[in-house]
Each structure stands twice: as C-alpha cells, then as structure tokens.
Interface confidence: low
C-alpha cells in the first residue's frame, strides 16, 4: 500500500525571524505578564488540612533570582479537632518552571535554560498501604 | 548561590542585572524531569480535595503542553468517602515561566512569559463571615 504524502510539515519560518547561531536560541527575558498576580484564597497555607511553610531561595546567577519553595509542616494531616492525624499523609504538590542560569567561564558569560521543580503547596491524601506477603 | 568571582584580567563588563536579551544554549538542564503529572503521581485521585487534570496545549509555547488542575468538589472528601461541605477544596496556584515564540512561528527566538497555573487542590477550613 502506498503511503500518502505527508503534507506541509513545518512551521513556515517567517522572513522576520532573527538570525540565530546554530545550537542556541535568542531569548528576550523581558517577561510578558510580569505584573500578573496570584489570586489564591487567603492564607491557604495555614488553613489547609495539610499546612505548609514557604522558604525563599535566592541566587544572583539565576533569573528570576527569587524562587519560593513550600514545605509541608506535618507528615500527617490536621483533623477537625486541630490534631495531627497520621492515618493520612500531607504530600507536596510540585510544578516545573523555567529559569535562566548565568554561567561564568573565564572572562565569558553564557546563559543556560534550566527546568526547576517548585513545591507549590501540600495536599492531604489517603496513604497507599503495601501489604507484605 | 554565590556570584562566581571574575578573573581580575577580564574587562569590567560585569552587570549584576541580566541583559534584556540573551543567547541561550538550546540544550536545557534537568530536561528529563517528568512533565506529565498524571504519570508522576496519583495524588489528584487520592487527595481529600481531588482534582481533574486538563491538558492545555499551545504550539507557540514551550512547554507546549501544560496540565491545569480543576477541583472536583466544592467540599472535601471525608473518612466515609462523602463530600463534606464544612470544608472547601481550593486550587493551589503558581506563577511559572514559559517560553513564547516571538516573533510567532520563529524556530529559535523566544520571550519569557509568566503564566498562572492551578497545580492541584488542597482542603481548607472555610473563612466564615458573620453578618451583623
């Protein structure tokens, strides 16, 4: 059976595309939507049944320099009486984001994209129980 | 992190701020971390504030696929497996940076874009407003 010809197979590169050396890409780090703000419910990190704390990590050779990481406060979850229930588990919820890393090699500076895994908050889950034979 | 000291013989072009436009290596660090939350854990099903994951795809963006969480219930799941409306399932949102093709359709030219994603849900005690 003759395989039908695959159609137009690539984004047409517009004439306006900037020239870029091989193996690299041009990145404008002026952020689109820079002033967008998170509109999460108030103090959810304290009101959650799986509460968490925030830590700010700072690195001058990373853009953005500040990355906020959450850490679950408990192994278990907080019950209606305000006590920790260890029959349930507080677990971290994670999300990837991109950062730009600045590297110094001798007198030259290079830039590298990096995926960073950010812990955003915690959720309360029923544990998986493994039964040993 | 610390700023790596420069060789004293280097021209003094060190700038504490990042330049507006940079050329970056196409290779990405930590690129093999798992990007599909459905594959990385089943918390979305086991949580007391479970959520569904919706695929958001945009070929002009990297990553082209982002998963958005939507809480399944207003309340939370109690020990009996029922929805308890005395508690609230709320989304946990996070600003992340992605790459946007700029100009559009160009293979190797991007701009950073900040987007707001709902990553999962958590169960919270509601704020009760008492009306006088």
């Amino acid at each position: 059976r003759k395989i039908p010809k695959v159609g137009h197979t690539f984004f047409q590169k517009p004439e306006s595309c900037p020239p870029v050396p091989g193996g690299s890409m041009k990145l404008d780090i002026g952020i689109i939507n820079e002033n967008q703000r998170v509109s999460m419910s108030r103090n959810i990190e304290s009101r959650s049944t799986s509460p968490w704390n925030y830590t700010v990590t700072w690195d001058p050779n990373r853009y953005p320099s500040e990355v906020v990481q959450a850490q679950c406060r408990n192994l278990g979850c907080i019950n209606a009486q305000g006590k920790e229930d260890i029959s349930m588990n507080s677990v971290p919820i994670q999300q990837e984001t991109l950062v730009v890393r600045r590297k110094h090699q001798g007198c030259s500076v290079s830039f590298q994209l990096e995926k960073v895994l950010v812990t955003v908050g915690c959720t309360c889950v029923t544990p998986v129980i493994h039964h040993v034979q | 992190g610390i700023t790596i000291p420069r060789n004293p013989g280097c021209p003094n072009s060190e700038d504490k701020n990042f330049p507006r436009t940079v050329m970056v290596n196409l290779n990405i660090h930590n690129r093999n971390t798992n990007t599909n939350p459905k594959r990385s854990s089943d918390y979305y099903n086991r949580s007391t504030s479970p959520w569904n994951l919706h695929r958001n795809e945009d070929p002009e963006r990297y990553p082209s696929v982002i998963w958005e969480a939507k809480c399944r219930h207003l309340g939370c799941i109690n020990a009996d497996g029922n929805v308890d409306y005395h508690m609230n399932s709320v989304p946990i949102q996070q600003e992340i940076l992605v790459l946007r093709r700029e100009p559009p359709h160009c293979p190797n030219s991007f701009r950073l874009e900040k987007i707001l994603v709902s990553v999962g849900c958590t169960c919270v005690t509601p704020i009760v407003h008492h009306v006088a």
């Epitope: 695959v6 | 990405i28 690129r31 990007t35 070929p59 990297y62 990553p63 082209s64 696929v65």
Partner: nanobody, 122 residues
Framework: EVQLVESGGGLVQAGGSLRLSCAAS??????MGWLRQAPGKEREFVAA????????YYADSVKGRFTISKDNAGITMYLQMNSLKPEDTAVYYC?????????????????WGQGTQVTVSS
Amino acid sequence: EVQLVESGGGLVQAGGSLRLSCAASGRTYDAMGWLRQAPGKEREFVAAISGSGDDTYYADSVKGRFTISKDNAGITMYLQMNSLKPEDTAVYYCATRRGLYYVWDSNDYENWGQGTQVTVSS
C-alpha cells in the same frame, strides 16, 4: 493521527552498523524523532529532525556515531547507526511531535510507532 512503522532492527556485533527506517502517514508534524528504551530504564531521546529537514538534534551519547535523515517527501525517516556499543541495546521508537521547543523531551512526543528491537552483542 500519524501512523508510524519502524523497521531495520536486529542483532549486530559491537562496532557494527544498522539502519533503521520509519515510514509516516497521516497528519502533519513539525519534528520526527528516534527514542529508545533499554530494559528497566526510562525512555530516552536519541535523535530528531525537523519537518523541513533543516535541523537535526542528537543525544550526547550518540553524537558522531548516529546520523538522522529523511527523504525529500518527508515520508520516511532514517537512523544510520555506526560504531554500535552494547549500551545501545534497546527498543527503538520512532515518534512525531508538534513544535521544536525541546525535541529531547520525550514526554512531548504525540505519536509513537510500535518499536524495533536493536541488540548489540559484545
């Protein structure tokens, strides 16, 4: 949906060569790639080529030994594998994707072939 059919796998001695082929039919794509999975390991990126054929990408572990190419019609993609090593033993998959963002991110490939076994004996 793109249909993909791989061929060309087999058993070869270390230092030998193989040529894999992948025939594509159906929807358009921006890039085609070869990915592999060794027993008990994660699926990993090997090489990719843009739909236009202008851009090729290789994993560090195969650079200089493997060459990816495609025919002018964009229907068949090839992976010429030279100087094969025992650690190249794996099931090799052909896959397509939209966008050339990071062709080495195996999670972003949408359509996969059934795979072809490559075994390199020492």
